[in-house]
Each structure stands twice: as structure tokens, then as C-alpha cells.
């Protein structure tokens, strides 16, 4: 299935390309997958199709959903799907995992950070760049076309970099921001802001009352030896050791693993004889190192039994 995830923030422009490629002369039709309703091509609409591109000018949270594009040629039709999620603007600085584009690595010799997705937009230089929400200032930072160059890269330069630019459509301007992590490589590996692999944030796990269940907290911290990298569980914001419930135990020790060369750490929370009151608790997976802390929350729900007549 030719499907592509795209995401954006409300009140910003979002442009999505059909995941099925074809000659620019081919006709591309866009539809709301749920309703099969055709998306208009007239530019006066807030959401409109423009060949291979689907434009949200600006995007709204309600635009989230799956969109179908069909590339039509004289001899074949190709279908693709764009899975679009529009998020509310975050009140604080931290950019959540789900708004991050792919991580890029740099070294003293090569420290280019490309602004993600910018090629889809009609923008004019210069780009604005921010690190951990602070505008970048100083001669070490140079904005070149669609990328940022950092001179004399140091490990402190690792962090989340956001590019901000203006998309122009028929004289109207729309803001766009995109964020990606930048890591600094050295011979001994590197460490980065913790990335939690499991659980997904705000996940719900179905459990059977009276049975045992395990919750795994798994996070990656960088490449090579990692220092002060810890994963742990909290219950309702408290340490497991402060929570006097012998049925709920975090396994002793932490398993180190290497995933795609990344150093990852896991710990398992074991809940014996699940009770109703366990469904009321908030289970937080915390991953921390000297770069910072990330927290993902999971809750338990009663497994629904589907009765077949």
C-alpha cells in the first residue's frame, strides 16, 4: 500500500505530495478517503488539490485523516494514500516526538541541517532557525538556502532545530515550521535527547482483570557507550518504590540493547493479578540522560469481549 505520513500544525500551511509518482503531465485526482468526495482544484478553497500536491492553506485540526490520490495516465491508474495529522500548537517549547522529522547527524567537517519538506513550498530566503526554541544568533550559524550550517560543531550543538519560513500562494502568506533533531558524531559515538520506542505516548493497553500483564519502557540514547541513561516507570507521578503495592514491581536492572547501532535501554513493569483499581492509575515511562527527559504515558483498560451469537 503506497501510503505516506504527513503532519503539520494548525494555522500553518501544509503541502502534501502524492506518494505515487508520475509525469507532471498526468492528471492527479484527490479524494477524502472516508467519503470518496473529490477535493476541489479551485485555489479559493482552503484545502485544494494542485496536481501531485494537496494544499492546506492553512491547516486545521479537523483536516486530519486519510486522503486518496489517483495518478491517471492513458495506460494505467496508480493509487496512493496520504495520512495527514494536524496538531494543535504546543503551549511550551518541547517539540513532541510525533512532530519531529528524521534525525540528522553532523561532525566538525559536515554540519548541514536541511529544513524538512521545504521543497514543496513556494518560499523565499532567508529561513529563520531556532534551537530548542531559541533563535540562533552569532557568526557560527549560517543560513544557506534551505539548510543551516554550523561552524566548529561541538557536542553542545546537539538538540532540536526548527526552521521557519513563509509559503506564498497567490499573494497570501502562510507560516510553516518544521523540527528535526541534530546529533553530533565523534569517534566515541554520541548521545542525544532520549527517544522512547515504547510505549507510544497516551497509549492504552487492554488487560484481563485477574491476569498478569507486563509493560515495557524502552528508549534509545545515542550511539556507543551511554552515561546516566536511565529508563524507569512511575505510577501517578510517583516512583515505584514509593508506591506500596507489592503486585506491581519494576524489574531489577536494565537491559541494554543495540538497535541499528543505537544504544537502547529497556525496563519492564510487571503487574500481577490485575485489579480494577489498576485501571485508574497513570503509568509513565521516563527516559532520561544528561541531555534531558522524555515521558510517555500509558493507561490500562479492560479487555472487551466480543460475543458471537
Amino acid at each position: 500500500k503506497f501510503s505516506k505520513q504527513s503532519w503539520g500544525l494548525e494555522n500553518e500551511a501544509l503541502i502534501v505530495r502524492c506518494p505515487r509518482q508520475g509525469k507532471s503531465s498526468y492528471i492527479v485526482d484527490w479524494y477524502y478517503s472516508q467519503t470518496n468526495k473529490s477535493i476541489p482544484t479551485q485555489e479559493r478553497n482552503r484545502v485544494f488539490a494542485s496536481g501531485q500536491l494537496l494544499k492546506f492553506l492553512p491547516a486545521e485540526v479537523a483536516d486530519s485523516g486519510i486522503y486518496t490520490c489517483i495518478v491517471r495516465s492513458p495506460t494505467f491508474n496508480r493509487t496512493g494514500y496520504a495520512n495527514v495529522t494536524i496538531y494543535k500548537k504546543q503551549p511550551d517549547c518541547n517539540v513532541p516526538d510525533y512532530l519531529m522529522y528524521s534525525t540528522v547527524s553532523g561532525s566538525e567537517k559536515n554540519s548541514k541541517i536541511y529544513c524538512p519538506t521545504i521543497d514543496l513550498y513556494n518560499w523565499t530566503a532567508p529561513l529563520e532557525w531556532f534551537k530548542n526554541c531559541q533563535a540562533l544568533q552569532g557568526s557560527r550559524y549560517k543560513a544557506h538556502k534551505s539548510f543551516l550550517v554550523i561552524d566548529n560543531v561541538m557536542t553542545d550543538d546537539a538538540g532540536d532545530y526548527t526552521c521557519k519560513f513563509i509559503h506564498n500562494e497567490n499573494g497570501a502568506n502562510y507560516s510553516v515550521t518544521a523540527t528535526r533533531s541534530f546529533t553530533v558524531k565523534d569517534e566515541q559515538g554520541f548521545s542525544l535527547f532520549p527517544v522512547i520506542r515504547a510505549p507510544a505516548h497516551n497509549e492504552t493497553k487492554e488487560v484481563e482483570i485477574g491476569e498478569n500483564t507486563n509493560l515495557t519502557c524502552s528508549a534509545c540514547f545515542g550511539k556507543g557507550a551511554q552515561f546516566l541513561a536511565t529508563v524507569q516507570w512511575q505510577l501517578n507521578g510517583n516512583k515505584i518504590t514509593d508506591f506500596s503495592e507489592p503486585r506491581i514491581q519494576q524489574e531489577e536492572g536494565q537491559n541494554q540493547s543495540f538497535s541499528n547501532g543505537l544504544a537502547c535501554v529497556n525496563t519492564v513493569l510487571r503487574i500481577a493479578d490485575v485489579k480494577e483499581e489498576d485501571l485508574l492509575l497513570r503509568y509513565d515511562c521516563l527516559a532520561l540522560n544528561l541531555h534531558g527527559l522524555r515521558r510517555h504515558t500509558i493507561r490500562l483498560s479492560r479487555k472487551h469481549h466480543h460475543h458471537h451469537h
Epitope: 518541547n94 553542545d156 566515541q188 532520561l288 544528561l290 534531558g292
Partner: antibody, heavy 116, light 107 residues
Amino acid sequence: EVQLVQSGAEVKKPGESLKISCKGSGYSFTSYWIGWVRQMPGKGLEWMGIIYPGDSYTRYSPSFQGQVTISADKSISTAYLQWSSLKASDTAMYYCARIGGMFDYWGQGTLVTVSS
Amino acid sequence: EIVLTQSPATLSLSPGERATLSCRASQSVANALAWYQQKPGQAPRLLIYKASNRATGIPARFSGSGSGTDFTLTISSLEPEDFAVYYCQQYYGWPITFGQGTKVEIK
């Protein structure tokens, strides 16, 4: 410019409570750990604990667990170190430090004197 | 906890001389070791991180080496402003710990 500005020197009596502060500026306060370090008169540095202001998660050195409380108010970019009942042995210089992968920026220090 | 032992406690040298400071860990800390300089009445200043990386703005006369349990801070040619107390710090395991310090004084 990254800066950590600590509150002024304090003179207290044993048994009194105290809260000293460390205000961060010039960077995203919620995105970096703040650590507290004690230095008793004529002695070395002792790591007390850290807080992640974006989440208010704290971690203490075992020697200081239960002796002090570290907190933060991210709305005013300020971290705190507090005692509920001071002892003469708490007399020291206290430093806060930003941890950006390392203790890279330090406050100027707050001298706390506890004497009857 | 990991104990760091610095030696010597005091080093008496003249400007222009080479200073060699040692820091030994009670167990391996890989390369998770930093060095700080502290002058009287001032906050510590980061010199070296990850055992051998100079922090921003630190002169090239300061260098760090070692890994595992044995580390060295070398000042190739002492300047008058280098006379101070130097601390090593490990950040390999909780709790973070400092050495007791080495005082570099003018002979």
C-alpha cells in the same frame, strides 16, 4: 547569552527554613537540567541533585536525599533549593549549574550561613 | 557510588612549567569524565568534557587524556591565571561525583 543568576547571601539560625533561587535566562529553561552543587568552607564540590524544569522530575544524591528539596517554577524560569530545618553544617556556598550534556554554565553562588 | 581520588593534593610550580594532574576512579567510568577550574570566590568553570574534549573558549594549553579509571589533566605551560583548584567529575553513573581537588599554586 546564557545566564544563571542566584539569590543573595543568607544568614539563618539553626531550625529555620530557607529557599534559595536560581533564575535562568538566554536559553529554553524547560529543555535543560539544573543541578545544585554544595561547597562547604575550604572544601571541595559535592553534587546534590538535579531537576528537569520541563517535567519537574528530580534526582538526588543519596547524601542529600531527604535533607533538601529541589523544585522549579518554569513560568518564571527559576529553580529552587530549600531546607525545612537548617543545621549549622548546612553553612556553605551553593551553586546551581545548567547541564547541557555537561555542567556548562554556573550561577555565581549563594552563601548560606547558619549560626546561632 | 563512584569515588574519584585526585593527586597530588597540592602542586607547587612556576609560570611556564608543565602541570600534570591525576584523577583515579574507584571503578571504570569509560570516558565520562570532566575537569573544572575554580578560582577563589568564583564558580567552577568547565575545562574538559568526555575526558579529552576542550570546552568552548578553553585555551589549547589545557588537555585531557585517559579512559576507564585513570585520567590526566595537563597544562602544557602555566600562565599566571592558571593558578587555581582543579576538580575532576564523573558522570558515568548516579550519583554524579567530584574528586576532592588539586590546588595548583605558585612556587
